[in-house]
């Protein structure tokens, strides 16, 4: 699987999940988020050669087509597969508010 366990431990040029830390205050200007200060959002990148974690028959065919026709622009894209939520804490006035934000952390990628 093209997940963090594999991708973060290997120098993989092809489609894989890559580490990306986002600081809420410095990177996004969200000064009001109290905790966490930031988090590993991660992202997917890298080429999708034939049979590389193909998501659908279409992406398999597209990957084969691109392998056999390297000059063609059509090829599968490396995109998130599994995402996890992130819990944040902020204050409304002096009242703490905890929210779970869905699909915030990329855990694995696929070619689609």
């Amino acid at each position: 699987a093209l997940d963090t366990n594999y991708c973060f431990r290997n120098l993989e040029e092809n489609c894989c999940v890559r580490p990306l830390y986002i600081d809420f205050r410095q990177d996004l200007g969200w000064k009001w988020v109290h905790e966490p200060k930031g988090y590993y959002a991660n992202f997917c990148s890298g080429p999708c050669p034939y049979l590389r974690s193909a998501d659908t028959t279409h992406s398999t065919v597209l990957g084969l087509y691109n392998t056999l026709n390297p000059e063609a622009s059509a090829s599968p894209c490396c995109v998130p597969q599994d995402l996890e939520p992130l819990t944040i804490l902020y204050y409304v006035g002096r009242t703490p508010k905890v929210e779970q934000l869905s699909n915030m952390v990329v855990k694995s990628c696929k070619c689609s």
Epitope: L28, V92, E99
Partner: antibody
């Protein structure tokens, strides 16, 4: 230049709902909280609630008894305020106003031009 | 809810004089070393505009004839050398507690 442009005046019957839009430009919509404030004729300002457009978090003033729903469309940088079960006491100018950016509840540094909602049978 | 009481309700000032508006909160609006109190002016037929942020910080583009002071529960907005363009209704606002609340307004007129 930061701009908040609201939809036009509305006339509604008692018991109906109204939905006011606030189209923004000149800043990153998903970076700031958007507040809604109402002002009855000749009266002061009442905070209705707020929304964080990036993922739709909302905080409401209990004064509005769950009649207010705030939404946002990030693709068009537009915020919406819907008020249901309208009554005569809801006749007011409704403003959208951008939060200053340091806190969730905050001062408001840019305001829309206001939308007059009239309730009449 | 925190109740904001402004005095006076209305004020008539001669040009070039100084006007003072008071705002008293029903409980302290101070937290974490800040006073969560702000001031707005609503000119006739217009939307409110932010003048003073966090009790004493002048908002960008606002004349330095406006100044704010105070802490805890008692705050003051001062307008020096009053001009015709300063007429309108002034509001204080707190955001230390949910819900955010405004004062009832002070109407400033020129003599």
């Amino acid at each position: 230049e930061v701009q908040l442009v609201q939809s036009g005046a509305e006339v509604k019957k008692p018991g109906a709902s109204v939905k006011v839009s606030c189209k923004t430009s000149g800043y990153i919509f998903m970076k700031y909280w958007m507040n809604w404030v109402r002002q009855a004729p000749g009266a002061g300002l009442d905070w209705m609630g707020q929304i964080f457009p990036a993922w739709g978090s909302t905080n409401y003033n209990e004064m509005f008894e769950g009649r207010v729903t705030l939404t946002a469309d990030t693709s068009t940088s537009t915020a919406y305020m819907e008020l249901s079960s309208l009554r005569a006491g809801d006749i007011a100018v409704y403003y959208c106003a951008r939060g200053y950016g340091n806190y969730a509840l905050d001062a408001m540094d840019y305001w829309g031009q206001g939308t007059l909602v009239t309730v009449s049978s | 809810d925190i109740v904001m009481t402004q005095t006076p309700p209305s004020l008539s000032v001669s040009p070039r004089e100084t006007a003072s508006i008071s705002c008293r909160a029903s409980e302290s609006v101070d937290s974490y070393g800040n006073s969560f109190m702000h001031w707005y002016l609503q000119k006739p037929g217009q939307s409110p505009q932010l003048l003073i942020y966090l009790a004493s910080n002048l908002e960008s583009g606002v004349s330095d004839r406006f100044s704010g002071s105070g802490s805890g529960t008692d705050f003051t907005l001062r307008i020096s050398r009053v001009e015709a363009n300063d007429t309108g209704v002034y509001y204080c606002q707190q955001n230390n507690e949910d819900p955010l609340t405004f004062g009832q307004g002070t109407k400033l007129e020129l003599k």
